[in-house]
């Protein structure tokens, strides 16, 4: 069964940020700022075409 | 540090798993300067279909 879409799971560390409990709460400024920066960054990286978007962002302690 | 996990969606056939990882790794320097994010330990894998069918791209 082909959906016409390929999905990739990506994981990485951000070593200059500290994890705290506000990254477990999507309503906090810290969570939303980091999510916005990461989303913007991926649009920059994969701007050549074919990139449809990202989902299921999760933050956890490193 | 903070571990970030997410799912990326692409039109089928437009990118392979190697280029997803390579293009991300090549952007790390710019990520540090533009977003002040120091990125390391990048890992990419393809998502098995049953999982990906439930998770839309957004």
């Amino acid at each position: 069964l082909s959906t016409g879409v390929s999905f990739f799971f990506l994981s990485f560390h951000i070593s200059n940020l500290q994890f705290n409990s506000s990254l477990e709460d999507p309503s906090t400024d810290y969570y939303q700022e980091l999510q916005r920066d990461i989303s913007e960054m991926f649009l920059q990286i994969y701007k050549q075409g074919g990139f449809l978007g990202l989902s299921n962002i999760k933050f956890r302690p490193g | 540090s903070v571990v970030v996990q997410l799912t990326l969606a692409f039109r089928e056939g437009t990118i392979n798993v190697h280029d997803v990882e390579t293009q991300f790794n090549q952007y790390k320097t710019e990520a540090a300067s533009r977003y002040n994010l120091t990125i390391s330990d990048v890992s990419v894998s393809d998502v098995p279909f049953p999982f990906s069918a439930q998770s839309g791209a957004g």
Epitope: S6, G49, G50 | G13, N16, H18, T22, D46
Partner: antibody, heavy 120, light 107 residues
């Protein structure tokens, strides 16, 4: 028209090095990745690695990371592969091959091949 | 690493025969599968990419199919000029491994 012209055959002694060139013409050299492939006599094809001449980014098959170095000269539109510490098992035809542009996952043009013979 | 296993390693068929070469990947390569034809003493030539897309100038008697880990190249009516060795290649992840080749001869 697109052409990849490789340097001529080489005969080297064990322990020596050799540098094979691949001169590209008919397209913008910096916008296509160049791969290198080994074919030992009577054998199949083995992927060595690639270079992106625009960024000089290289990626090697782990098997060849201590055997080969890939470089590119943008001004000469030429890719190079240097092989080190040659042994008899390095005797092979070596091909350069261009990877198609964006979202093109195949080798659309190949050089004519360079035979490297390692013999004492 | 993804291993590519081609079968058969050699085959002999008559002009006009339908011939199928198969290629099995050790993991899902998501249709990032390429077929090349190599004639004796020549460089390989691109035939099929993305598992089923025929490259320009390749006769329509060639076709590619498959998905996941199983792929095949079919020649619907074998011609004398099809005598060559055929290779499949994984282009999903590095190393971009090739199958061991299938040598095709005319009976």
């Amino acid at each position: 028209q697109v052409q990849l012209v490789q340097s001529g055959a080489e005969v080297k002694k064990p322990g020596a090095s050799v540098k094979v060139s691949c001169k590209a013409s008919g397209y913008t050299f910096t916008t296509y990745t160049m791969h290198w492939i080994k074919q030992a006599p009577g054998q199949g094809l083995e992927w060595i690695g690639y270079i992106n001449p625009g960024s000089d980014y290289t990626h090697y098959n782990q098997k060849f990371k201590d055997k080969a170095t890939l470089t590119a000269d943008k001004s000469a539109s030429t890719a190079y592969m240097e092989l080190y510490s040659l042994r008899s098992e390095d005797t092979a035809v070596y091909y350069c091959a261009r990877q198609g542009n964006y979202a093109a996952y195949y080798f659309d043009y190949w050089g004519q091949g360079t035979l490297v013979t390692v013999s004492s | 690493d993804i291993q590519m296993t081609q079968s058969p390693s050699s085959l002999s068929a008559s002009v006009g025969d339908r011939v199928t070469i198969t290629c099995r990947a050790s993991g899902n390569i998501h249709n990032f599968l390429v077929w090349y034809q190599q004639k004796p003493g020549k460089s390989p030539k691109l035939l099929v990419y993305n598992a089923k897309t025929l490259t320009d100038g390749v006769p329509s008697r060639f076709s590619g199919s498959g998905s996941g880990t199983q792929y095949s190249l079919t020649i619907s009516s074998l011609q004398p000029e099809d005598v060559a060795t055929y290779y499949c290649q994984n282009f999903w992840n590095v190393p971009f491994t090739f199958g061991q080749g299938t040598k095709l001869e005319i009976k």
